[in-house]
Interface confidence: low
């Protein structure tokens, strides 16, 4: 439905506080060194433009494209070429390749100062002060940090964060009430962000298809009582409401979600019946529940798989005539029969289904050829299977750090090229999948794990992408989205990495390490572990455990010192003398 | 090679008892619900006994219960069915059959069967 002006049409649909926000969160995605002062003010040009386009669409430039209107708000920043270099070259471009270009720029690990938390009464009072500026402030720290947080949810971040405050500020433990829900939001966030990079990179790098057969396996686990046909339609709503966020069109994305939200709660009957809870809510927290619904039960009448994908004789018939709609009900159908199987697996099924076809609907005896396809499933089946069950045993035998360090050791000498924070980030991520998933029974495991684990290695593959210094590592993140794991799985020691030169100075430690939190101080251990590896990869598990145990024990002593930074200095130079020695440096 | 395979059938006299085996071979049995169905000469296959994957959800037939028992061991990947208290009308050929996760309602909602085994009360 055309609109004469799509600045009035979003402004209407979505309300001026939505619309503000979203708008914020363009901005701060796209001009992410931007400070805050200067984003508000484009914000409040552009309300202030779409309230008149609301009042008459016919006025000047209101029938102008959103991105020309953006774009050339952002273009107007006088800083542009001194803060963002080349990216100021993108404004000399028209639409549509000036927005690419903003978009070619986003930076996922932007040079920004980590975010450090004011005590709890001075954030009352700044929140007191002024509500409407302290929540914009959120919305523009974490939407430059994370150039692609979905713009929805954020909002629904943001009414949360605003709900905690407004709560705790005025409880009698302030601290006590506040910092929980911080650390939750902070976490819950961190993922929710990685999620959607996951989603972005699948569309960018993969293309549509890639999504939507992510999507068709995804939905159908979740609604394995919709129709085929049904399925199909918030497949391609929802690729289209993602494609808009990625492409940094959050108007767009955050007006169809809405819509998307709606259709699903008046067709719930035909969806899923777990779906009443969600949709007696509010519309961002409706929407957020939706996207986390837990799946619905199987029908108990379902017929085998077989009958219609290996046994019938109009198998090539019915894949020569519409190619994607079979290969996409053969999704549909394993997907629906398989809630205990990750989305990734499902696709390489369905990938390996798709490869034998091509071959056996040219084949003399095309039946005779697919007969025994079922079978090629088995050995793809069984790798997360066993993959899961051996590292949940590491994870309950070591326990969550040691996990880590397991993984740590374990991926510094795949890929030692990659740079050490990093590595640090990355393995303490994938780390996490214990304590994530290895509680659940095992019809839950592998879709908890395998799929967290893709989420993990994309943000590994995007923060290469920006600074590529291994070919192992371009490999396993380009060949294919869904054999991604597997492939980082598969990487043995690299012979060909020739270790880093030693420096003390690396190792060096002083009293500032008493004073971190338990997570800092593990983060500084492991950054030291992963250096050694870089310059000693062949040292075994023993010998790299001696040297953990005994820095643990040095960091312990020394922190307990009268005089702190002496211990850490005499000590230090001790534990480095004997951990070369131990290493044969 | 996935396979099903029954055993434990064979001739009881009325009042007698008999422990039947399902043993798969080429997949595990963790992530699968194992249902016994049964076949008398001339008759529908009918469903006898299920247990879902997590062992936690099992049910029965109204005509064997009270009299029959199923369980699974998946370290040995195999389901038994013990039948206590036999009737001539319990004669039929045993099958096993696997679907994934959960019992179903219909018969072809299994995606593999045994080739089954014969248990014949008879005095």
């Known amino acids: 439905d055309a609109h004469k002006s799509e600045v009035a049409h979003r402004f209407k649909d979505l309300g001026e506080e939505n619309f503000k926000a979203l708008v914020l969160i363009a901005f701060a995605q796209y001009l992410q060194q931007c400070p805050f002062e200067d984003h508000v003010k484009l914000v409040n040009e552009v309300t202030e433009f779409a309230k008149t386009c609301v009042a008459d669409e016919s006025a000047e430039n209101c029938d102008k494209s959103l991105h020309t209107l953006f774009g050339d708000k952002l273009c107007t920043v006088a800083t542009l070429r001194e803060t963002y270099g080349e990216m100021a070259d993108c404004c000399a471009k028209q639409e549509p390749e000036r927005n690419e270009c903003f978009l070619q720029h986003k930076d996922d690990n932007p040079n920004l100062p980590r975010l450090v938390r004011p005590e709890v009464d001075v954030m009352c009072t700044a929140f007191h002060d002024n509500e409407e500026t302290f929540l914009k402030k959120y919305l523009y720290e974490i939407a430059r940090r994370h150039p692609y947080f979905y713009a929805p949810e954020l909002l629904f971040f943001a009414k949360r964060y605003k709900a905690a405050f407004t709560e705790c500020c005025q409880a009698a433990d302030k601290a006590a009430c506040l910092l929980p829900k911080l650390d939750e939001l902070r976490d819950e966030g961190k993922a929710s962000s990685a999620k959607q990079r996951l989603k972005c990179a699948s569309l960018q790098k993969f293309g549509e298809r890639a999504f939507k057969a992510w999507a068709v396996a995804r939905l159908s686990q979740r609604f394995p009582k919709a129709e085929f046909a049904e399925v199909s339609k918030l497949v391609t709503d929802l690729t289209k409401v993602h494609t808009e966020c990625c492409h940094g069109d959050l108007l767009e994305c955050a007006d169809d979600r809405a819509d998307l939200a709606k259709y699903i709660c008046e067709n719930q009957d035909s969806i899923s019946s777990k779906l009443k809870e969600c949709c007696e809510k509010p519309l961002l927290e409706k929407s957020h529940c939706i996207a986390e619904v837990e799946n619905d039960e199987m029908p108990a009448d379902l017929p085998s798989l077989a009958a219609d994908f290996v046994e019938s004789k109009d198998v090539c018939k019915n894949y020569a005539e519409a190619k994607d709609v079979f290969l996409g009900m053969f999704l549909y159908e394993y997907a629906r029969r398989h809630p205990d199987y990750s989305v990734v697996l499902l696709l390489r099924l369905a990938k390996t289904y798709e490869t034998t076809l091509e071959k056996c609907c040219a084949a003399a005896d095309p039946h005779e050829c697919y007969a025994k396809v079922f079978d090629e499933f088995k050995p793809l089946v069984e790798e997360p299977q066993n993959l899961i069950k051996q590292n949940c045993e590491l994870f309950e035998q070591l326990g969550e750090y040691k996990f880590q360090n397991a993984l740590l050791v374990r991926y510094t000498k795949k890929v030692p090229q990659v740079s050490t924070p990093t590595l640090v980030e990355v393995s303490r991520n994938l780390g996490k999948v214990g304590s994530k998933c290895c509680k659940h029974p095992e019809a839950k495991r592998m879709p908890c794990a395998e799929d967290y684990l893709s989420v993990v290695l994309n943000q590994l593959c995007v923060l290469h992408e920006k600074t590529p210094v291994s070919d192992r590592v371009t490999k396993c993140c380009t060949e294919s989205l869904v054999n991604r794991r597997p492939c980082f799985s598969a990487l043995e020691v690299d012979e060909t990495y020739v270790p880093k030169e030693f420096n003390a100075e690396t190792f060096t430690f002083h009293a500032d390490i008493c004073t971190l939190s338990e997570k800092e101080r593990q983060i500084k251990k492991q950054t030291a572990l992963v250096e050694l590896v870089k310059h000693k990869p062949k040292a075994t598990k023993e010998q790299l455990k001696a040297v953990m145990d005994d820095f643990a024990a040095f960091v312990e002593k020394c922190c307990k010192a009268d005089d702190k930074e002496t211990c850490f200095a005499e000590e230090g130079k001790k534990l480095v003398a004997a951990s070369q020695a131990a290493l044969g440096l | 090679q996935v396979q099903l395979q029954e055993s434990g059938g064979g001739l009881v006299q009325p009042g007698g008892s008999l422990r039947l085996s399902c043993a798969a071979s080429?997949?595990?049995?963790?992530?699968?619900?194992i249902g016994w169905f049964r076949q008398a000469p001339g008759k529908e296959r009918e469903g006898v006994s299920c247990?879902?994957?997590?062992?936690?959800?099992?049910n029965y037939a109204d005509s064997v219960k009270g009299r029959f028992t199923i369980s699974r061991d998946n370290a040995e990947n195999t389901v038994y069915l013990q039948m206590n208290s036999l009737k001539p009308e319990d004669t039929a050929v045993y099958y096993c059959?696997?679907?994934?996760?959960?019992?179903?309602?219909?018969?072809?909602?299994?995606?593999?069967w045994g080739q089954g085994t014969q248990v014949t009360v008879s005095s």
């Open positions: 247990i879902a994957s997590s062992g936690g959800s099992t």
């Open positions: 059959a696997a679907a994934v996760l959960e019992c179903r309602t219909v018969v072809r909602g299994y995606d593999y």
């Open positions: 080429g997949f595990t049995l963790d992530y699968y619900a």
